[in-house]
């Protein structure tokens, strides 16, 4: 699987999950989240050659098409597969609230 | 929706489904499919700015991150959303077989 365990410990050039730290204020302009100040969101990056963790029959077809037509702009793209929630603290008036923001952290990627 | 109805009739620069015809022999090297000789597979292409058909909370965060950090390599990608099957004819010996190949045609796209 193209997950953090594999990707963070390898020098994989193809589609893999990469490390990315996002600071809520600096990178998003969000002031409403009190905690955490930022988080390891990660992101997906790398080419999607034929047979590399392809998502659907269409992805396989497109990767093979790309192999036969190297100059084509049609190619599968490396995108998130497994996403995890992020617990946050925000304030409603003076009262702190804890909430889980769903689908915030990338744990693995796929070629779609 | 970034589907064929909207995308094929517009000059949309952002993520949208684009026309792509794939010839099984020429483009994939497949000789086993008797009919059709090729099909309109389509593909997804175009940038994914903030608020443009974003798939998950993560996609929104990443698009906003990209807006604040324009030079970053982390950005959402335009990928298939709705896929349709393709009926094909192939031969087993001299006997023709009809089968549906699932997830072969892109009908709409999303930013993931």
């Amino acid at each position: 699987a193209l997950d953090t365990n594999y990707c963070f410990s390898s020098t994989e050039k193809n589609c893999c999950v990469r490390q990315l730290y996002i600071d809520f204020r600096k990178d998003l302009g969000w002031k409403w989240i009190h905690e955490p100040k930022g988080y390891h969101a990660n992101f997906c990056l790398g080419p999607c050659p034929y047979i590399w963790s392809l998502d659907t029959q269409y992805s396989k077809v497109l990767a093979l098409y790309n192999q036969h037509n190297p100059g084509a702009s049609a190619a599968p793209c490396c995108v998130p597969q497994a996403l995890e929630p992020l617990p946050i603290v925000y304030y409603v008036g003076r009262k702190p609230k804890v909430e889980q923001l769903s689908n915030m952290i990338v744990r693995s990627c796929k070629c779609s | 929706a970034l589907d064929t109805n909207y995308c094929f009739s517009s000059t949309e620069k952002n993520c949208c489904v684009r026309q792509l015809y794939i010839d099984f022999r020429k483009d994939l090297g497949w000789k086993w499919i008797h009919e059709p000789k090729g099909y309109h597979a389509n593909f997804c292409l175009g940038p994914c700015p903030y608020i443009w058909s974003l798939d998950t909370q993560y996609s929104k965060v990443l698009a906003l991150y990209n807006q604040h950090n324009p030079g970053a390599s982390a950005a959402p990608c335009c990928v298939p959303q709705a896929l349709e099957p393709l009926p094909i004819v192939y031969y087993v010996g001299r006997k023709p077989k009809v089968e549906q190949l699932s997830n072969m045609i892109v009908r709409s796209c999303k930013c993931s």
């Epitope: 730290y21 204020r25 905690e35 617990p87 | -």
Partner: antibody, heavy 117, light 103 residues
Framework: EVQLVQSAAEVKKPGASVKVSCKTS????????MNWVQQAPGAGLDWMGQ????????NYNGKFKGRVTLTADTSTSTAYMELSSLRAEDTAVYYC??????????WGQGTLVTVSS | EIVMTQSPASLSLSQEEKVTITCRAS??????LAWYQQKPGQAPKLLIY???NLADGVPSRFSGSGSGTDFSFTISSLEPEDVAVYYC?????????FGQGTK
């Protein structure tokens, strides 16, 4: 290289105020929260508050009952902690510390403030 | 205010022994915990962040574990230079309280 350099030790009389500075270098000052921590002689660590130099937002520890004011000068990349109405129990080492990734990763060398009549 | 209860208050061990310090939060702080080392006359030094991550340049004999309310800090094989006071600190809503320290 990230560096936080604090002002020299101070001796103050009870009831007075003290302003400790923390000059930073090696990172974008406006993009990280700056925390301040108190450590009385032979005691543990006490979080006082934090400031976001980019917009001046602050969070304070209620324990210091409005006696602490945090400010930042973006032109010199310097953070300040002012403690007013000083009393003997405020005698302590005061640290500035940069906030990063759910921790304080870089600390100043500390400034000793002695309150004595 | 979240209360951090650290134990034990002090330890006396020999070189190469294993050290374990615990820290308990009064409420769920997820993984928002850091561990520091402080030597006499020096500022605290970050060892572990986000409960389990080793800070840059910190020897691998130091490790952290736990999430929620119960956390542990371990030195796998004690070295003479590890003599210090160790503190935990939460980062789950201000004020960011510290544990009492372990000497």
């Amino acid at each position: 290289e990230v560096q936080l350099v604090q002002s020299a030790a101070e001796v103050k009389k009870p009831g007075a105020s003290v302003k400790v500075s923390c000059k930073t270098s090696g990172y974008t000052f406006t993009s990280s929260w700056m925390n301040w921590v108190q450590q009385a002689p032979g005691a543990g660590l006490d979080w006082m508050g934090q400031i976001y130099p980019g917009d001046g937002d602050t969070n304070y520890n209620g324990k210091f009952k409005g006696r602490v004011t945090l400010t930042a000068d973006t032109s010199t990349s310097t953070a300040y902690m002012e403690l007013s109405s000083l009393r003997a129990e405020d005698t302590a080492v005061y640290y500035c510390a940069r906030h990063y990734d759910g921790s304080t990763d870089y600390w100043g060398q500390g400034t000793l403030v002695t309150v004595s009549s | 205010e979240i209360v951090m209860t650290q134990s034990p208050a002090s330890l006396s061990l020999s070189q190469e022994e294993k050290v374990t310090i615990t820290c308990r939060a009064s409420e769920n702080i997820y993984s928002n915990l850091a561990w520091y080392q402080q030597k006499p006359g020096q500022a605290p030094k970050l060892l572990i962040y986000a409960a389990t991550n080793l800070a840059d340049g910190v020897p691998s004999r130091f490790s952290g574990s736990g999430s929620g309310t119960d956390f542990s800090f371990t030195i796998s094989s004690l070295e003479p230079e590890d003599v210090a006071v160790y503190y935990c600190q939460h980062f789950w809503g201000t004020p960011y309280t510290f544990g009492q320290g372990t000497k």
